[in-house]
């Protein structure tokens, strides 16, 4: 859960498990399963299988989320699980559509106040640590549906009610229309569509492409911000280096982002964030001597 993320000492500079945006198609191999005299065949995919105890995890997360967020107390977690399950169970896992997730999306409808949406790209853990502190700002994973699925993998198989715990399609090696990728594309699109006011995005200044057109942010969210509702996008470029004082807002990929956003009639601002690890370390250990004295 988010508390576990906050408890982690280290800040990891990576995208996280749910950004699958290259579109390669392939076919997995078949392996026999079942112990009867007639072998049953299960597709062998290139990706890791469904996270163990997936149904229990989703249900438990739903219960915890609705306890902590009073505005979602009306949500029936059993119905949420049924809708989640219905999106991928008995379906060929390379042929999942956004339509499959609509019943779940409907149940998980939630609004973020204007100016309080935080998008992120390739810097998931720090974005989550930040929204733990700044409680009234929200990443997708602070919303019910994102919270349920964060860091999980799932898939089923055609014509059986079973969950596949052995393997699931890899978006690069197998197919892009798999249950996990389609889920994140669906909820990311919706999250961006409903944003209003000034929207913030946290970007990883340690990457060669600070803004990457192939990330979920670059390929889905940027294009689904609504100019009639969103006045501006403010990018926070997070510096990783201790002595890094460069102005990364001048980076060519940031200029590219500015161009895309400006063409969509949304204003663009950029801010360098130096030493965010310092702030978050002091959240974690307020008595640390470096937090009580000068730099």
């Amino acid at each position: 859960g988010l508390n576990d993320i906050f408890e982690a000492q280290k800040i990891e500079w990576h995208e996280g498990s749910h950004h699958h945006h290259h579109h390669h198609h392939g076919s997995g191999s078949l392996v026999p399963r079942g112990s009867g005299s007639l072998p049953r065949w299960r597709q062998q995919w290139s990706g890791s299988g469904t996270t163990s105890r997936f149904p229990e995890t989703v249900l438990a997360r739903c219960v915890k989320y609705t306890e902590v967020h009073p505005e979602m107390r009306h949500v029936d977690c059993q119905s949420v699980w049924d809708a989640f399950k219905g999106a991928f169970i008995s379906k060929y896992p390379c042929n999942i559509t956004e339509e499959d997730y609509q019943p779940l999306v409907k149940l998980g409808t939630q609004t973020v106040p204007c100016n309080k949406t935080l998008l992120w790209s390739r810097i998931k853990d720090l974005a989550h640590q930040f929204t733990q502190v700044q409680r009234d700002m929200f990443t997708l994973e602070d919303m019910l549906l994102g919270y349920l699925a964060d860091d999980l993998t799932w898939c089923g198989e055609f014509n059986t009610f079973e969950i596949n715990y052995q393997s699931c399609p890899d978006w690069r090696k197998d197919c892009s229309n798999n249950p996990v990728s389609v889920f994140w594309k669906t909820v990311s699109r919706r999250f961006a569509e409903t944003a209003c006011g000034v929207v913030h995005v946290m970007l990883n200044g340690s990457r060669s492409k600070i803004f990457d057109k192939n990330s979920t942010f670059g390929s889905v969210e940027v294009h689904n911000l609504q100019p009639e509702k969103v006045q501006a996008l403010e990018a926070w470029v997070i510096h990783g280096g201790r002595e890094d004082s460069r102005d990364l807002c001048q980076d060519p990929t940031i200029k590219e982002l500015e161009s895309i956003i400006s063409k969509r009639n949304i204003r663009f601002f950029c801010k360098n964030i130096y030493r965010p690890d310092k702030f978050l370390q002091c959240v974690k250990n307020p008595e640390d001597s470096s937090c009580l004295s000068g730099i």
Epitope: Q134, R135, I273, P276, K278, F279, C282, G294
Partner: antibody, heavy 125, light 107 residues
């Protein structure tokens, strides 16, 4: 040790604005958040909002939304609280305080330590 | 908004006595509560955080306990410098809110 020193007392007319400053010393300004809390005569302490200077993000309590603006100047390690459209009920001592985080059950807890010495704002015609 | 109710409003006691102050929350706030001391003309000072953890430099005679909706601040043996107003504050839910205070005065 972190010390917060606030600007002096102010007397203001109803309808006007007041801007109180809070200068931090002895600590790393970008490594913490600053909150503003007020205490009106005979009333309980009231949290108004906060700022996280390194990100520039603010939170305002709904009661003060639209009337309060909290800002910070990293170069001088100073936080500011401006309250507009003043009325007599805004007569109070205004405190700034560093936010100290604790281990919460879901979110990190927000405590106040240390506090500035307070600034008395009197609103009177 | 979570409402914190402190009792008694005033507690009259003598130096050396034990003082027990109560803070009740309008809904469960787990252990997300702090206690502050305020003397006349001064800013509040953090005494206890996370329900029972003493802040840096706070004497051992101050202790906090409780979780859910019922919390207690105990001063085991009152010293002359302990006569002041005490406030509780919750951090479970935004907005952060304070209790109305308990004044501890000399009997």
């Amino acid at each position: 040790q972190v010390q917060l020193v606030q600007s002096g007392a102010e007397v203001k007319k109803p309808g006007s604005s007041v801007k109180v400053s809070c200068k931090a010393s002895g600590g790393n300004f970008i490594s913490y958040s600053i909150s503003w809390v007020r205490q009106a005569p005979g009333k309980r302490l009231e949290w108004m909002g906060w700022i996280i200077p390194i990100f520039g993000t603010t939170t305002y309590v709904q009661k003060f939304q639209g009337r309060v603006t909290i800002t910070a100047d990293e170069s001088t390690s100073t936080a500011y609280m401006e309250l507009s459209s003043l009325r007599s009920e805004d007569t109070a001592v205004y405190y700034c305080a560093r936010v100290k985080y604790g281990s919460g059950s879901y979110y990190p807890n927000n405590w106040f330590d240390p506090w500035g010495q307070g600034t008395l704002v009197t609103v009177s015609s | 908004e979570i409402v914190l109710t402190q009792s008694p409003a005033t507690l009259s006691a003598s130096p050396g006595e034990r003082a027990t102050l109560s803070c009740r929350a309008s809904q469960s706030i787990s252990s997300n509560l702090a206690w502050y001391q305020q003397k006349p003309g001064q800013a509040p000072r953090l005494l206890i955080q996370d329900s029972s953890t003493r802040a840096t430099g706070i004497p051992a005679r101050f202790s906090g306990s409780g979780s859910g909706t019922e919390f207690t601040l105990t001063i085991s043996s009152l010293q002359s410098e302990d006569f002041a107003v005490y406030y509780c504050q919750q951090s479970d839910n935004w907005p952060l809110t304070f209790g109305g205070g308990t004044k501890v005065d000399i009997k």
